[in-house]
Interface confidence: low
């Protein structure tokens, strides 16, 4: 099980002193990256028990393996469900603490109930402040059951749940009808997935026989030991004031674990620390009792004395839980409660024993979970013990489970079970990720999800050019940092793979899937300069540039022109995809805008140095088109045009421009200026007889405006060929030769 403990400080005279602390004993707990150990989370769970909103609670992290929640301002802040989440991947575990108000109408006789599948669970709510109304039972916040007030038995309301199944697990509450939910009795029911003493997918495996109130986990068969006990079967007591799977944590404060509630992963639940009991864990055990909640009885024999933290303390010459075993009986010594090996390794396991008569090599045997018995290959005999060494055949996954070392002499026998965890070396499920690339280096994230078991001890990155048969280059990297592969060839594909290892012999996993990463092209180094530019209209700009002459081929795929409109904070980019191009027409620009212009060479995705910038002012756009343009033939060489001034003029018109074109003709059109902007009529002279002409016009203020609609008209017949059209306005007879 995950080594995760949620401690609640139950000294409740002042809510502001109340705190919850979540402590993880896991390796690398809380480092914060998904693949290598997510952070510890500690929060109030308001999904089932909602309390009035108050100031936010304060979360303080003490290193990577401890987090504390403070900032409770009033007693109602404390009521409800709190949870701590820790562990990584499949081992991610939630530990739950349920807090009851000491002033509630109803109080639970026992908050946490752990029962086996098929058992009958009995939740008992003690009447603290009586009300003559129904008692409503809820399960996970939903109505479950109602009891009448006269159904109290000995001042308690009982909820019997026969034949419970795992889905029955959850938060139960008993509330007087229409009383505040904060006055409820809150319970936590944990239903193991198997019947008593069994575990595993089909509940076919036998639990190791957890001691001292430990609870057998229905998924992995491990004992979840009460606070203050350790070992595969919780057989060993910690020193007073210590807890955690290896007794590595110490209770805060001078009074040790007094006043603290300990919550551990399911199916254990919560209890006081070893040596303490009571609703606030402030009462020491009565004589003859010990352990978490003082639930255990010493029953010491042969002069043993009862210690409320550890149980029987045996006099010299005796051992055993109740000091019932004579030291003459052989005894397994210092056997580790848990061993870990990697798949397909062939480890050596040692088992030491003492006794009188002295154990010899043949009297010590090792039994695997499948019942296979291994005999030792050699034994080391010392004055105080015999150590048998066993060579284990190649390990398979089925070897995970409880192994047993057994010693038998004429003085009796002893055995010690220990857990063997066969771990699968990690194999990356994905290829490493390319973060950035340059022409001679790749920056790679080696952090990938993996199958198999952690923790990850080393990460190797293997790489070589694609389609190459040369040896792989390998670097060992820190899994939490990005890696830069250096001294690579430009514009080259590299095959890159990750290999993960876990601690111990044979911990190297298979290589992960390859990925192709390609280095970038060489950076273009030439700096262009702008030769010139000219405006071809209010929204069009033609730009030309040059490059310095250098020997060898040009390193570049094209040019990037950038126009920066500082007023609007907008950049326009124009890609010229030929490296031979030296001119470009930019269209669709904004009239009347001041642009900063530069050009740079690009190669692949890399940009070379930009040219020195130029500043270009586009003329503003002209006025709207003249309205209602009309043409009328006057003779065989004259046509009169009439129009109306444009509407919504931004300023005074400086002139009109008329465009004349022979209909269907191939030549360029002629433009004629009308320099008297107040006019609304003009005569175009010098036209050819019997010829159809097209006319349109536009106004100019600072820049030329939009063209009007085009009109058609034919001159009258039988005239002579004219020299070319000229214009005469109605106010003045002067013409303009074109």
């Amino acid at each position: 099980a995950v080594d995760l403990t949620l401690l609640a400080n139950l000294r409740l005279t002042d809510p502001q002193r109340f705190f919850l602390t979540c402590v993880s004993g896991e390796a690398g707990a809380g480092r914060g990256s998904d693949a290598w150990g997510p952070p510890l989370l500690l929060e109030k769970d308001d999904r089932i028990v909602r309390t009035p909103p108050g100031p936010p609670l304060r979360l303080a992290r003490n290193g990577s393996h401890q987090v504390t929640l403070r900032g409770f301002s009033k007693p109602s802040d404390l009521v409800g469900v709190f949870s701590c989440v820790g562990g990584a991947g499949a081992r991610r575990t939630r530990v739950i603490y349920v807090h009851n108000s000491p002033g509630a109408h109803l109080l639970p006789d026992k908050v946490t109930h752990t029962v086996n599948k098929g058992d009958t669970a009995v939740l008992s709510a003690r009447v603290h402040k009586e009300k003559q109304t129904d008692v409503i039972w809820k399960s996970n916040g939903s109505y479950f059951y109602t009891l009448d007030w006269h159904e109290a038995q000995d001042g308690r309301f009982l909820l019997q749940l026969p034949n419970v199944q795992p889905p029955s697990s959850g938060i139960y509450s008993a509330t007087y009808l229409e009383a505040s939910p904060l006055g409820s009795a809150f319970f936590r029911l944990i239903v193991r997935g198997c019947g008593a003493g069994r575990w595993g997918p089909g509940c076919t495996k036998e639990c190791p026989g957890c001691l001292h109130g430990g609870v057998c986990h229905d998924h992995d068969g491990e004992c979840v030991c009460p606070p203050g006990f350790t070992g595969t079967r919780c057989e060993q007591a910690c020193r007073e004031g210590r807890f955690g799977q290896s007794c590595q944590e110490q209770c805060p404060g001078i009074s040790g674990c007094r006043g603290l509630t300990f919550c551990l992963p399911d199916p254990y639940g919560c209890s006081c620390g070893s040596g303490w009991r009571g609703s606030q864990c402030q009462e020491a055990c009565a004589p003859g009792h010990f352990g978490a909640d003082c639930r255990l009885q010493c029953q010491c024999q042969n002069g043993g004395t009862c210690d409320r933290f550890s149980g029987c303390v045996c006099p010299s010459g005796w051992h055993g839980v109740h000091c019932e075993k004579s030291d003459r009986i052989p005894q397994i010594l210092n056997m580790a409660s848990e061993l870990e090996f990697n798949l397909e390794t062939m480890p050596r396991i040692n088992c030491a024993a003492a006794g009188n008569p002295f154990p010899v090599r043949g009297s010590i045997e090792l039994r695997k979970p499948d019942g296979t018995v291994l005999l030792s290959t050699k034994a080391i005999v010392e004055p105080e013990k015999t150590t048998a060494e066993f060579e284990v055949p190649r390990l398979v996954l089925a070897d995970s489970g409880f192994w047993e070392c057994r010693v038998s002499t004429s003085g009796g026998q002893d055995s010690r079970r220990f857990k063997v965890n066969v771990k699968v070396p990690p194999v990356p499920l994905a290829a490493p990720r390319l973060l950035t690339k340059q022409s001679r280096q790749l920056v790679v994230s080696p952090l990938v999800s993996f199958s198999g078991d952690g923790p990850i001890s080393t990460v190797r990155l293997h790489y070589r050019p694609q389609d190459s048969t040369m040896d792989w280059s390998t670097i060992v990297v820190d899994p939490s940092e990005n890696v830069t592969l250096m001294n690579l060839r430009p514009k080259t594909g590299y095959s890159v793979r990750v290999q993960l290892s876990r601690p111990g012999e044979g911990g190297e996993g298979a290589w992960g899937p390859p990925t192709l990463m390609t280095t970038d092209c060489p950076e273009p180094l030439l700096q262009p300069w702008l030769e010139g530019w000219h405006v071809e209209g209010t929204d069009r700009l033609r730009v030309s540039w040059s490059l310095p002459l250098v020997p060898g081929p040009l390193v570049g795929d094209g040019f990037l022109l950038r126009l920066w409109d500082g007023t609007r904070g907008q950049e326009r980019r124009e890609n010229v995809s030929s490296p031979q191009a030296r001119t470009a027409l930019l269209t669709g620009l904004t009239p009347g805008t001041h642009y900063q212009l530069d050009v740079q060479l690009y190669h692949c995705t890399l940009l070379g140095p930009a040219s020195p910038p130029a500043h270009v002012l586009l003329p503003p756009s002209g006025p709207p088109a003249p309205r209602h343009l009309h043409a009328q033939a006057l003779s065989d060489s004259e046509i009169q045009l009439t129009w109306k001034h444009p509407e919504a003029l931004p300023g005074p018109i400086s002139k009109y421009v008329v465009e004349v074109q022979v209909a269907g003709g191939a030549g360029d059109p002629l433009w004629i200026d009308v320099d008297r902007p107040e006019e609304t009529s003009t005569i175009i002279r010098g036209l050819n007889a019997s010829t159809r002409y097209l006319f349109r016009m536009r106004a100019s203020i600072q820049g030329l405006g939009d063209w009007s609609n085009t009109v058609e008209e034919s001159t009258l017949g039988n005239g002579l060929q004219a020299e070319g059209p000229v214009q005469e306005s109605r106010a003045a007879e002067e013409g303009l030769d074109q």
Epitope: Q132, T133, D134, V135, F144, Y145, D148, H150, E151, L177
Partner: antibody, heavy 119, light 109 residues
Framework: EVQLLESGGGLVQPGGSLRLSCAAS????????MYWVRQAPGKGLEWVSS????????NYADSVKGRFTISRDNSKNTLYLQMNSLRAEDMAVYYC????????????WGQGTMVTVSS | DIQMTQSPGTLSLSPGERATLSCRAS???????LAWYQQKPGLAPRLLIY???RRGTGIPDRFSGSGSGTDFTLTISRLEPEDFAVYYC??????????FGGGTKVEIK
């Protein structure tokens, strides 16, 4: 005198609606859980719905869930049953009843009102 | 749902005789949350017993209730003429719905 008096019954077509009322007197209405119980002609008793004192908690038999709505007006000492989408099998005498103390045993009953569902 | 089964369906007795009515639940009725009612033709039911054995207000002591778990009994020690009616049991201690038995008719022999 403690009394419950139902009204609002009558003839209605299948798919139609009716609203039953139950006027309470002689006790503190707002402190009691109230119930509707029905009895089809010649048949036994069937619990229909419950409403707790404040009106915040209501429960229904599966046969009426989603069609019937129980409510109460504590200021008027009145219990209601809104019946929609009525079916032939809803035809019965409808009684309102009071829960004894905090109990679901019914110590006071009204005289009943007949609901006939027929086309 | 908890089914309530009453027996016998009809009980033919004479005034002065002892009547024993049975009510059986399909599963345990918690803490004796069982009631008995009397109903006369054209009238509303009347609460006799609640909590399996407690008499309702104004109920004569010739009516008594007993039993627990799944088996309950209503006893009328000496039948009076006004006691001839239909009697229903009702469980109210389990998860909803509240359920009634089918009734026992006590008729004059």
């Amino acid at each position: 005198e403690v009394q419950l008096l139902e009204s609002g019954g009558g003839l209605v077509q299948p798919g139609g609606s009716l609203r039953l009322s139950c006027a309470a007197s002689g006790f503190t209405f707002s402190q009691y859980t109230m119930y509707w119980v029905r009895q089809a002609p010649g048949k036994g008793l069937e619990w229909v719905s419950s409403i707790y004192p404040s009106g915040g908690w209501t429960n229904y038999a599966d046969s009426v869930k989603g069609r019937f709505t129980i409510s109460r007006d504590n200021s008027k000492n009145t219990l209601y049953l809104q019946m929609n989408s009525l079916r032939a099998e809803d035809m019965a005498v409808y009684y309102c009843a009071r829960g004894r103390g905090g109990s679901k045993a019914f110590d006071i009953w009204g005289q009943g009102t007949m609901v006939t569902v027929s086309s | 749902d908890i089914q309530m089964t009453q027996s016998p369906g009809t009980l033919s007795l004479s005034p002065g005789e002892r009547a024993t009515l049975s009510c059986r639940a399909s599963q345990t009725v918690s803490s004796g949350s069982l009631a008995w009612y009397q109903q006369k033709p054209g009238l509303a039911p009347r609460l006799l017993i609640y909590g399996a054995s407690r008499r309702g207000t104004g109920i004569p002591d010739r009516f008594s209730g007993s039993g627990s778990g799944t088996d309950f009994t209503l006893t009328i020690s000496r039948l009076e003429p006004e006691d001839f009616a239909v009697y229903y049991c009702q469980q109210y201690g389990s998860t909803l719905p509240l359920t009634f038995g089918g009734g026992t008719k006590v008729e004059i022999k």
